[in-house]
Amino acid sequence: PPRGRILGGREAEAHARPYMASVQLNGAHLCGGVLVAEQWVLSAAHCLEDAADGKVQVLLGAHSLSQPEPSKRLYDVLRAVPHPDSQPDTIDHDLLLLQLSEKATLGPAVRPLPWQRVDRDVAPGTLCDVAGWGIVNHAGRRPDSLQHVLLPVLDRATCNRRTHHDGAITERLMCAESNRRDSCKGDSGGPLVCGGVLEGVVTSGSRVCGNRKKPGIYTRVASYAAWIDSVLA
């Protein structure tokens, strides 16, 4: 099943997020991803957990998953590099770098997103954009077109309350509000963008969606700058 959803969001402006990628398994959307370099897409490590026997590809330049669009192109994956410390049973280090079979053809609808290198927290209350092709309601409806939602960042202390994520949110993770509007499993690997810069990647741990006491969890890319740079080098 696809890992994720944008709950309570709205349809994104077509091709206004040219960094947005759909990580696909056997031709179907599995996870979100974000183009961070001409030949590299950043996603979540857990996305490929069940993909051992399938064909993983990356769709770039898409708004609709099904309709023909001039900018759309499906790339094979040359190499999949999960973070070495990622594990199936934790949300920590949930990052994956996918090397495309060739450099992406860049244009207005396909362009890498600058990512945050300064290792500091996003200030609570800052509004950040998260986008994806995940399920849009609790009935499980999957959208054909890219959805997005603007969410306020939540402070770590609140997110770590016993009633919320009970201490699971390390300094390498961040949270955003989840009151009826949320990212969720199937949006895993997708980007959390604050002020036009990639700050977080949707984690793919299982959690209830759209419940304000279970905020969305995102991996802070700045905390992994050294690893990203070493893989991209």
Partner: antibody
Framework: QVQLQQSGPELVKPGASVKISCKAS????????INWVKQRPGQGLEWIGW????????YYNEKFKGKATLTVDKSSSTAYMLLSSLTSEDSAVYFC??????????????WGQGTSVTVSS | DIQMTQSPASLSVSVGETVTITCRAS??????LAWYQQKQGKSPQLLVY???NLADGVPSRFSGSGSGTQYSLKINSLQSEDFGNYYC?????????FGGGTKLEMR
């Protein structure tokens, strides 16, 4: 076109409360944050807080917690701000304003015309 | 809370001149800043968002720049309709505070 139409001027007594409204039209009301901003006569602007009509989520400036309460009525596409325990310090023009989307960015792009609140005995 | 210090507080200029208004944040706000113009008795109007992006319908003589804690709004070849008050506002964490304003007056 996007419009935010605010209620008319209010003259209220110290200690009383007042509820001002902001009726939205020309866009999907539940999809956009509504901010409230205070401007004292001849002074600058102060951010009071925002509400997201789709969920009712609110964020307040600590300074206005207990003073301002933000609500919405989705059926009429109207945002409200209740100001309580009014003093002369609350005499000001209050603006509602929408946060709009620009690709993955956002900005407070449309403003109401303002509602003047005068607190006087 | 992040403080926004705007300067100058007032500026007396002539039509055709170029002016620069600055806004300094008490800490890094990572370009999460907007500029507004407000005429007497009117609502503020968005000019620039995320430090450098010109809002729809804003003349190209306006431009925003800056990063970190220092931001500027530049108006080239000032027109008569540009006189009024200008405010910056940050969006890096709540509360989204405004600068104290700059009053642009005709000399």
């Amino acid at each position: 076109q996007v419009q935010l139409q605010q209620s008319g001027p209010e003259l209220v007594k110290p200690g009383a409360s007042v509820k001002i409204s902001c009726k939205a039209s020309g866009y999907s009301f539940t999809d956009y944050y509504i901010n409230w901003v205070k401007q004292r006569p001849g002074q600058g602007l102060e951010w009071i807080g925002w509400i997201f009509p789709g969920s009712g989520s609110t964020y307040y400036n600590e300074k206005f917690k207990g003073k301002a309460t933000l609500t919405v009525d989705k059926s009429s596409s109207t945002a409200y701000m209740l100001l309580s325990s009014l003093t002369s310090e609350d005499s000001a023009v209050y603006f509602c304003a929408r946060t709009g989307y620009y690709s993955n960015l956002y900005a407070v792009d449309y403003w109401g015309q303002g509602t003047s609140v005068t607190v006087s005995s | 809370d992040i403080q926004m210090t705007q300067s100058p507080a007032s500026l007396s200029v002539s039509v055709g001149e170029t002016v620069t208004i600055t806004c300094r944040a008490s800490e890094n706000i990572y370009s999460n800043l907007a500029w507004y113009q407000q005429k007497q008795g009117k609502s503020p109007q968005l000019l620039v968002y995320v430090a450098t992006n010109l809002a729809d319908g804003v003349p190209s003589r306006f431009s925003g720049s800056g990063s970190g804690t220092q931001y500027s709004l530049k108006i080239n070849s000032l027109q008569s309709e540009d006189f009024g008050n200008y405010y910056c506002q940050h969006f890096w964490g709540t509360p989204y505070t405004f600068g104290g304003g700059t009053k642009l007056e005709m000399r």
